[in-house]
Structures are given as structure tokens and as C-alpha cells.
């Protein structure tokens, strides 16, 4: 057993252009906290896989409010170490995941919001009992400086915390055959560790993993009283012939239970009793329970009351991931229909609809002409979510309220004169041209069929609407 310790020295913008000014969003002040996760081995594991060696959360740091001037290179951090206790042997090779979280303290509807600011993942080799290792890592535009070490907790010592020590049995030296435990001069190496579960009262061992029984006891863990003993009559563990070796191979031989689980025989099989944080037939599955508080951002931990049942996090709207650690960009799913603008307000989605559409997702097509009157005899034409008026002659504008001069756009070509008329406009063409807009030249031998001016209108008259 022992403790992994992580000391965060600084967290701040990395060097170079594009460094963020503040860890806080525009919504207001925030504060930082850290999560450390340890996984065994050097394999690349999914970020969601359990922190089998343990995890820890720091306290919240001081509140940070971005000042108008350039921010300090290092942000205010939580005080103290992050400590991750480990129950069994220190593996030596491990994956270290450090997450920097931001807690926003602005006027959040429904309270503070947590979001993952940076995550560094590093595979490392480290012997327990060694000095602090220092590291600098970049995560996006952020830079994290930290130190870490693994140390054993007495009576465990050694680079893997597997050697057990006990106090000296005599003032000047260790007991017979026992060497001092480095680096602790006042402690001595203990006898070998027996098979897991071996009875402390009725069993002993000379080699690690062994379980020899004292007279009158039998079974793989020396817990079964022997009705007839074939053991020698010696009464204590003073020599190799003191007791009985486990009779014959049993289902618990070699201890099939991983991760420090203890094995007990059942009829024709075995059963593993797993330590906290592990479950499965052979304790091979590492598990975090709801008591470890694995759900972030207001997530509710369901199940996982004990290591025999896995937990799941029910995430509040807007978050996802096995620990509710990922903020969902809900607008990326394009929930607003008919060209509506999506707004993620945190507590809910809002769609700002284009004219002519309504509903929570802009799904309702309004009757564009409902309640829309086109003046002066105009008719309403629906289309594309917006209404349009087709105006009667002589009127224009959005609602046909403006008087229109059909001649204003000079529709008559080649010097033709324009006359406003109740049915539209009429062009009086200059000699040599013809057509409704005087667009065609008359053949040299031809004559223009149009009169010089339509009956009832004199050229140059003010526009009249008959």
C-alpha cells in the first residue's frame, strides 16, 4: 500500500501566439480545480476507461476574474497536494492523466457550470520511494507544470511497496535471518507474504504465495480443522517440517483472484472476494463506485453502490460522456428547422425563427398572408416564409400603399414617349421604331402601325390613371 502524490506548480497560458487571456468564459468569474487519474501499465487506454489505480479531485482554487490588463502568467490554484492512495503493489509503469476543470461562477441558470479546460495524458515509469519527478506538459494553448512521486506507507517498503517491514526485534540487530529494511534503518524485513487469505492463526509460509498448515488444520488456507492429522507432531513454525503443505491441487491454487482479491473454495469452483475498486469473477475488472463521486456537471450516479456493480452517470441536458465530462454542442445537431438560428442557452435550446415560421424548433409554417392586407386592390402571394403583395396598376411598395409611376423607369426605347394608362403604360414610338416598348426598328419600306399618341392622351400630360 502507498500513496501517489501530485503537486501542481503552475497552470497558465503557454508561450507563443494565440495564448488565451483568461481561463474564464465571457460569462464571468471562474475558478480552477484538478482531477488526477491513474491507470496501470503503459497501454493507450480510452479516456473513459476506469482509473483502476485510483483518482483524486483537488479543492477549488481561488476565484479568478480577468483584469483588463494582461493576466498573470500563472493562474490562482488550489492549495495542497493531490493524493491517490493505492492499496496493492505500485505497478512502476502507469498512465497519468491530469485534467484541469473550470467552474464558472457567473449568473448560471441552475448554478455553477463545470467544463474541462485541459487534459494531459502521459505514460510514465516511476519507482516508489524515489525523489519527486518534475514535468511540464502542454494541453492546447495551456501549459501545466507539476511534480509527482509514489511513496509506500508502512509497513510496506520497496520500489513496488510489496516488501513488508516490522520493527527491530532487538535493539542492535534484526531477528535471525532478517535483513534491515532499506531505507528505514530502524525497521526489519518481515517474513515472506503468504498466499492471500492464509489463516493468520493456523497457517504460515516460508516462500511467498505458500500456505502451510499447523497441526490439526488443513485446506488451501488452513481454515479447515483436520479430523485425522498426518502432520508431524511439532507445534510451531520452527522448521520446514513444522506443518503440512496444502494437500493436492485445489481451485484456489495459484490464487486466480487478481488485484489482491482473496480466494475461497466453493463446491467444484472458487469465489473471489475483491478489494474496493475491483469486481468480476477474478477481480479483474477495476471499478469506481458512486461513493467516489465520478459524475461531473451535476450528473447523478446510478447503481455502483458497491464494487460488484458498475455505476453509470445520468447526465443533465447539455452534457455527455461516461462521467458527464463533455459539454454537448447541441446546436451542431441543427435542431432548428426552416433556416432558424440555434442558440444554446445552457439550460435550454432556443430557436430564433425566420419570418413566417414559429414553434420551439421553427417547425410550423405560418400562413404568410394571414392578417396581411394588400392595399389598393393588391393580392397577397405566399412564398418562402414571407408574404409579398402583387399590386394593382399604379401602386407599389410592400403593401401596395405607394403610388407608382409606370413611366418612371423610362420603359420606352429609342426615344419613345411614355403614357400612363389604366391598363398599364403605352409607348408612342419615334419614327422608325415599333413594338410595345419601341424595341423593334421598322423596315425601311415599312410603316409604324402605332399612332403617334393613343386616343385621349396628349404627349407630355401629367400622369393620369383612368
Amino acid at each position: 500500500a502507498g500513496v501517489f502524490e501530485l503537486q501542481i506548480h503552475s497552470f497558465g497560458p503557454g508561450p507563443g501566439p494565440g495564448a488565451p487571456r483568461s481561463p474564464c468564459s465571457a460569462r464571468g468569474p471562474c475558478r480552477l480545480f484538478f482531477r488526477v487519474c491513474l491507470k496501470p501499465g503503459l497501454s493507450e487506454e480510452a479516456a473513459e476507461s476506469p482509473c483502476a489505480l485510483g483518482a483524486a479531485l483537488s479543492a477549488r482554487g481561488p476565484v479568478y476574474t480577468e483584469q483588463p490588463e494582461a493576466p498573470a502568467p500563472d493562474l490562482p490554484l488550489p492549495n495542497g497536494l493531490l493524493q491517490v492512495p493505492f492499496r496493492d503493489a505500485w505497478p512502476g509503469t502507469f498512465s497519468l492523466i491530469i485534467e484541469t476543470w473550470r467552474e464558472e461562477l457567473g449568473d448560471q441558470i441552475g448554478g455553477p457550470a463545470w467544463s474541462l479546460l485541459a487534459r494531459v495524458t502521459r505514460r510514465r515509469r516511476l519507482a516508489a520511494g524515489g525523489p519527486w519527478a518534475r514535468d511540464i506538459q502542454r494541453a492546447g494553448a495551456w501549459e501545466l507544470r507539476f511534480s509527482y512521486r509514489a511513496r509506500c506507507e508502512l509497513p510496506a517498503v520497496g520500489t513496488a511497496c510489496t516488501r513488508l517491514c516490522r520493527p527491530r526485534s532487538a535493539p542492535s540487530r534484526c531477528g535471525p535471518g532478517l535483513r534491515p529494511c532499506a531505507p528505514l534503518e530502524d525497521e526489519c524485513e518481515a517474513p515472506p507474504v503468504c498466499r492471500a487469505g492464509c489463516s493468520l492463526e493456523h497457517g504460515f509460509c516460508e516462500q511467498p504465495g505458500e500456505c502451510r498448515c499447523l497441526e490439526g488444520w488443513t485446506g488451501p488456507l488452513c481454515m479447515v480443522p483436520a479430523s485425522t492429522s498426518s502432520c508431524l507432531g511439532l507445534r510451531g513454525p520452527s522448521s520446514a517440517t513444522t506443518g503440512c503443505l496444502v494437500p493436492g491441487p485445489g481451485p484456489c491454487d495459484g490464487n486466480p483472484c487478481a488485484n489482491g482479491g482473496s480466494c475461497s473454495e466453493t463446491p467444484g469452483s472458487f469465489e473471489c472476494t475483491c478489494p474496493r475498486g475491483f469486481y468480476g469473477l477474478r477481480c479483474e475488472v477495476s471499478g469506481v463506485t458512486c461513493a467516489d463521486g465520478p459524475c461531473f456537471n451535476g450528473g447523478l450516479c446510478v447503481g455502483g453502490a458497491d464494487p460488484d456493480s458498475a455505476y453509470i452517470c445520468h447526465c443533465p441536458p447539455g452534457f455527455q460522456g461516461s462521467n458527464c465530462e463533455k459539454r454537448v454542442d447541441r446546436c451542431s445537431l441543427q435542431p432548428c428547422r426552416n433556416g432558424g438560428l440555434c442558440l444554446d442557452l445552457g439550460h435550454a435550446l432556443r430557436c430564433r425563427c425566420r419570418a413566417g415560421f414559429a414553434g420551439p424548433r421553427c417547425e410550423h409554417n405560418l400562413d404568410d398572408c394571414a392578417g396581411r392586407a394588400c392595399a389598393n386592390g393588391g393580392t397577397c402571394v405566399e412564398g418562402g416564409g414571407a408574404h409579398r403583395c402583387s399590386c394593382a396598376l399604379g401602386f407599389g411598395g410592400r403593401d401596395c400603399r405607394e403610388r407608382a409611376d409606370p413611366c418612371a423607369a423610362r420603359p420606352c426605347a429609342h426615344g419613345g414617349r411614355c403614357y400612363a394608362h389604366f391598363s398599364g403604360l403605352v409607348c408612342a414610338c419615334a419614327p422608325g421604331y415599333m413594338g410595345s416598348r419601341c424595341e423593334f426598328p421598322v423596315h425601311p419600306d415599312g410603316v409604324s402601325a402605332l399612332p403617334a399618341a393613343p386616343p385621349g392622351l396628349r404627349p407630355g400630360d401629367p400622369q393620369r390613371y383612368l
Epitope: 441552475g110 455553477p112 461513493a291 447523478l300 450516479c301 446510478v302 443533465p316
Partner: antibody
Framework: QVQLQESGPGLVKPSETLSLTCTVS????????WSWIRQPPGKGLEWIGY???????NYNPSLKSRVTISVDTSKNQFSLKLSSVTAADTAVYYC????????????WGQGTLVTVSS | EIVLTQSPGTLSLSPGESATLSCRAS???????LAWYQQKPGQAPRLLIY???SRATGIPDRFSGSGSGTDFTLTISRLEPEDFAVYYC?????????FGGGTRLEIK
């Protein structure tokens, strides 16, 4: 303004199924978790269960074998069914909205008293 | 499940005084996922505090919450006549969601 309104029979016979509906206005049922809570006369509050529009449900283990909560997004409603009722199920039943910041209740219906009696 | 025990069961005070209500959890409540509610006779509960110390919208600042781990407190300073009611705590750290048994705050 978010409002929740419970509806359903106020009297249910023992061994029958209690059915209640909660109609939500002022909030989209697809944007939140929704819950049922009950309160026996003169006693404290007991959480029954919750539902999300996606169909995710979670029930109180003490009631799990008898409870079903369902949701109808088209009507902006969610419902509670509690089977094999006894007199111990007599209570004021509240529907409530679960907040976005966590699984606490930020809006409640006014409650409806359901009496189990023959 | 997490069992929440509220004390005292009944608290008798006068308007203008300060009230301190306690809520103790049988297991540590992670991330301070604890809420407080007020319930008046014939009415539904009303959310006062969430996250152990954050006031809900529209709640006067005479209501404040504190605590962490297993011990939480709701404090009402300068009691007003409308504050006399039953108060419940609720944890939302893990399922099942559980409420305390309530503290009745009555006029002395």
C-alpha cells in the same frame, strides 16, 4: 413561466393501478428530466422516479417493481403508473422538473391527493 | 442509499431571530450535491438552495446554505412571518434521490 399540472383520479381501489398525468407548459419536455415525488399525509417527501424524453428512466428501488413513468413529447406530458396499490400509497403526488445544474427540483406542480380505499 | 437526518425535528423561534437547521448524511455527499426546500401547508415545496450554498432564483439573501461532506446547514437570518414552514434537504449525488425527514419551523 414554467407550469406543471397533475391530473388523474383522486380515488383508487386497493390492488388497482394508480395513473396520473403531468401536463407541462412554458418549457419543452425534450429539454429536461421530469420526475414524480409523493408525500403521505403528515409525512415527508419520497422520490418515485424520473424520465428523460429519450426514454431514460430511473426509479426508487423501493417502488421499482410497481412503477412505470412514460413521456409523450407531442402533448408535452409525462405520466406515472403505480400498480398493485395499497392504503400505504395514499399520498399527495407531485410532478416536478429536474434542474439543469443537477438532479434537484426547480419547478413543482401543485400536487394531487390520491386516496387508496375500497 | 444515502440517508439524510434533519435536526431538530421542530424549531420554535420568534420573527427577527435567526434559525439554524441541520442536515446530516449517512455517507459523504460528493461535490456538495445537496438542495434545500421550503414547504408551507397545502403547497408544493419550493427550491431555496442547491449545491449546498447557491441560492435559487428569487430567494431572499436571508437564506444561506453551508457545509460539505456529511454535514450541511441552512441558516435563515432575521426570520420573517412567511418563513415559518417545513424545510427539507435533498441529496442528488447518487441514486436513489433522497430527502431528509424535515424540520418544522414554528412561531414561538
Amino acid at each position: 413561466q414554467v407550469q406543471l399540472q397533475e391530473s388523474g383520479p383522486g380515488l383508487v381501489k386497493p390492488s388497482e393501478t394508480l395513473s396520473l398525468t403531468c401536463t407541462v407548459s412554458g418549457a419543452s419536455i425534450s429539454s429536461f428530466y421530469w420526475s414524480w415525488i409523493r408525500q403521505p399525509p403528515g409525512k415527508g417527501l419520497e422520490w418515485i422516479g424520473y424520465i428523460y424524453y429519450s426514454g431514460t428512466t430511473n426509479y426508487n428501488p423501493s417502488l421499482k417493481s410497481r412503477v412505470t413513468i412514460s413521456v409523450d413529447t407531442s402533448k408535452n406530458q409525462f405520466s406515472l403508473k403505480l400498480s398493485s396499490v395499497t392504503a400505504a400509497d395514499t399520498a399527495v403526488y407531485y410532478c416536478a422538473r429536474i434542474a439543469v445544474a443537477g438532479f434537484f427540483f426547480d419547478y413543482w406542480g401543485q400536487g394531487t391527493l390520491v386516496t387508496v380505499s375500497s | 442509499e444515502i440517508v439524510l437526518t434533519q435536526s431538530p425535528g421542530t424549531l420554535s423561534l420568534s420573527p427577527g431571530e435567526s434559525a439554524t437547521l441541520s442536515c446530516r448524511a449517512s455517507q459523504s455527499v460528493n461535490k456538495n450535491y445537496l438542495a434545500w426546500y421550503q414547504q408551507k401547508p397545502g403547497q408544493a415545496p419550493r427550491l431555496l438552495i442547491y449545491g449546498a450554498s447557491s441560492r435559487a432564483t428569487g430567494i431572499p439573501d436571508r437564506f444561506s446554505g453551508s457545509g460539505s461532506g456529511t454535514d450541511f446547514t441552512l441558516t435563515i437570518s432575521r426570520l420573517e412571518p412567511e418563513d415559518f414552514a417545513v424545510y427539507y434537504c435533498q441529496q442528488y449525488d447518487r441514486s436513489p434521490l433522497t430527502f431528509g425527514g424535515g424540520t418544522r419551523l414554528e412561531i414561538k
